[in-house]
């Protein structure tokens, strides 16, 4: 199915316009901004979501890098170019003809250049580290309970098979969720770790992308897990290409 048939809405993406104009009068939903048809039984790609979000205020972040090749989303929001499948195009440019290359999660991985800049391929982000700090609780969470709950959440809410949750680390108050997904591992129909991480990030910030669902209520053995800060690191299959000037 593609959308909730009864009231013609998209359960996985509230930034859509839906109408019963699909084959046989079926409900069909299109993403705002791009007008592309989306499959409402799974997560919408991050590229289409960013495109739809462009009316929202800019929200730039600066994150600490855990290794020399880890990327963070310093550039904040931009209006991306998406391919016909909804993936980020390897080269992104703004209205002033400034261009740069991005990875599969849309994060810049080169210095900015002009229209002559070439981005030969869309480089896959195969490892995402989600770094969370939770609010103080009476005691530490049980690590295995926390691991189980986060894996359940990614499977049931974000439709990500637990085999792509490589590990859940915990040293109170820091939780790290490692998502890993090589190109060879990702089968047709598998949710992309970049999309799952983006939905999770928005949920954690209280900006849920889901239609008509309550916000994320994370509990471990009944104890609320309230996140007070989130950092996300992205590692690509091919290391990024930045000039030395940026690294100093």
């Amino acid at each position: 199915h593609t959308a909730a048939q009864d009231n013609c809405t998209c359960p996985t993406n509230k930034m859509t316009v839906c109408s019963p104009d699909g084959p046989g009068g079926r409900c069909q939903c299109r993403a705002l901004g791009s007008g592309m048809a989306v499959d409402c039984s799974t997560l919408t790609s991050k590229c289409l979501l960013l495109k739809a979000r462009m009316s929202a205020p800019k929200n730039a972040r600066t994150l600490v890098r855990p290794s020399e090749h880890a990327l963070v989303d310093n550039d904040g929001l931009y209006d991306p170019d998406c391919d016909p499948e909804g993936r980020f195009k390897a080269r992104q440019c703004n209205q002033t003809s400034v261009c740069w290359c991005v990875n599969s999660v849309g994060v810049r991985r080169t210095d900015k250049g002009d229209l002559s800049l070439r981005c030969d391929e869309l480089v896959r982000t195969h490892h995402i580290l989600i770094d969370l700090r939770h609010r103080p609780t009476a005691g530490a969470f049980n690590h295995s309970d926390l691991d189980a709950e986060l894996r359940r959440l990614f499977r049931e809410r974000y439709r990500l098979h637990p085999k792509f949750v490589a590990a859940v680390h915990y040293e109170q108050p820091t939780i790290q969720i490692e998502l890993r997904q090589n190109t060879s591992q990702k089968a047709a129909g598998d949710v992309d770790i970049g999309d799952a991480a983006y939905y999770f990030e928005r949920d954690i910030k209280g900006e849920s992308l889901f239609q008509g669902r309550g916000g994320l209520d994370l509990r471990v053995r009944g104890e609320p897990l309230q996140v007070e800060r989130t950092l996300i690191y992205y590692l690509d299959e091919i290391p990024p290409k930045f000039s030395m000037k940026r690294l100093t």
Partner: antibody
Framework: QVQLVQSGAEVKKPGASVKVSCKAS????????INWVRQAPGQGLEWMGV????????SYNQKFKGRVTMTRDTSTSTVYMELSSLRSEDTAVYYC????????????WGQGTLVTVSS | DIVMTQSPLSLPVTPGEPASISCRVS??????????MHWYLQKPGQSPQLLIY???NLESGVPDRFSGSGSGTDFTLKISRVEAEDVGVYYC?????????FGGGTKVEIK
Amino acid sequence: QVQLVQSGAEVKKPGASVKVSCKASGYTFTDYSINWVRQAPGQGLEWMGVISTYYGDASYNQKFKGRVTMTRDTSTSTVYMELSSLRSEDTAVYYCARYGDGYNQFDYWGQGTLVTVSS
Amino acid sequence: DIVMTQSPLSLPVTPGEPASISCRVSESVDSYGNNFMHWYLQKPGQSPQLLIYRASNLESGVPDRFSGSGSGTDFTLKISRVEAEDVGVYYCQQSYEDPYTFGGGTKVEIK
């Protein structure tokens, strides 16, 4: 405590359809997907598919595609498995089983429903 | 589909003695150190029950005489001292890839 209670035994004729129910209790229904597994007399276990209780859509074993439909009713915390175009080989005990927390293991099982297909 | 091959088919045991069941998988079910392999026991006339998940984790409420080991394609279920209540059919199962598949089963019976 977590419980999965299935509907009673059924006798069907070849070509007919059967709909088996599985009522969940003791936990938040939409937090865990439900699988269906069948077991022919004296045979092993065979996975038929899984339904997301959160979204309502299902993923089926290719072997049963086109014949099996899994649905759910959140108002009654019940999952249904309908198998159509029944043949004698479909005579089996049908189990619903809940996903466990982290690794897609099946941590709770229903008591099973015997479906007999006979002319 | 991933094929699960269990051995032996039948295992006559003496109470108090150890028992071991093997499960070989046609392709690896390991993902970043997590093995999507589980063991179930189906006692006579009952539904299957989960014993071990993720190859070696004991399910809550299961006696610690049960243990699981292995990774990749070769897995083992061990019972340190078999008790009369352990009789039934033991199944291994992979949940790495759809369709999830089970081994053919090992029937454990008291000698």
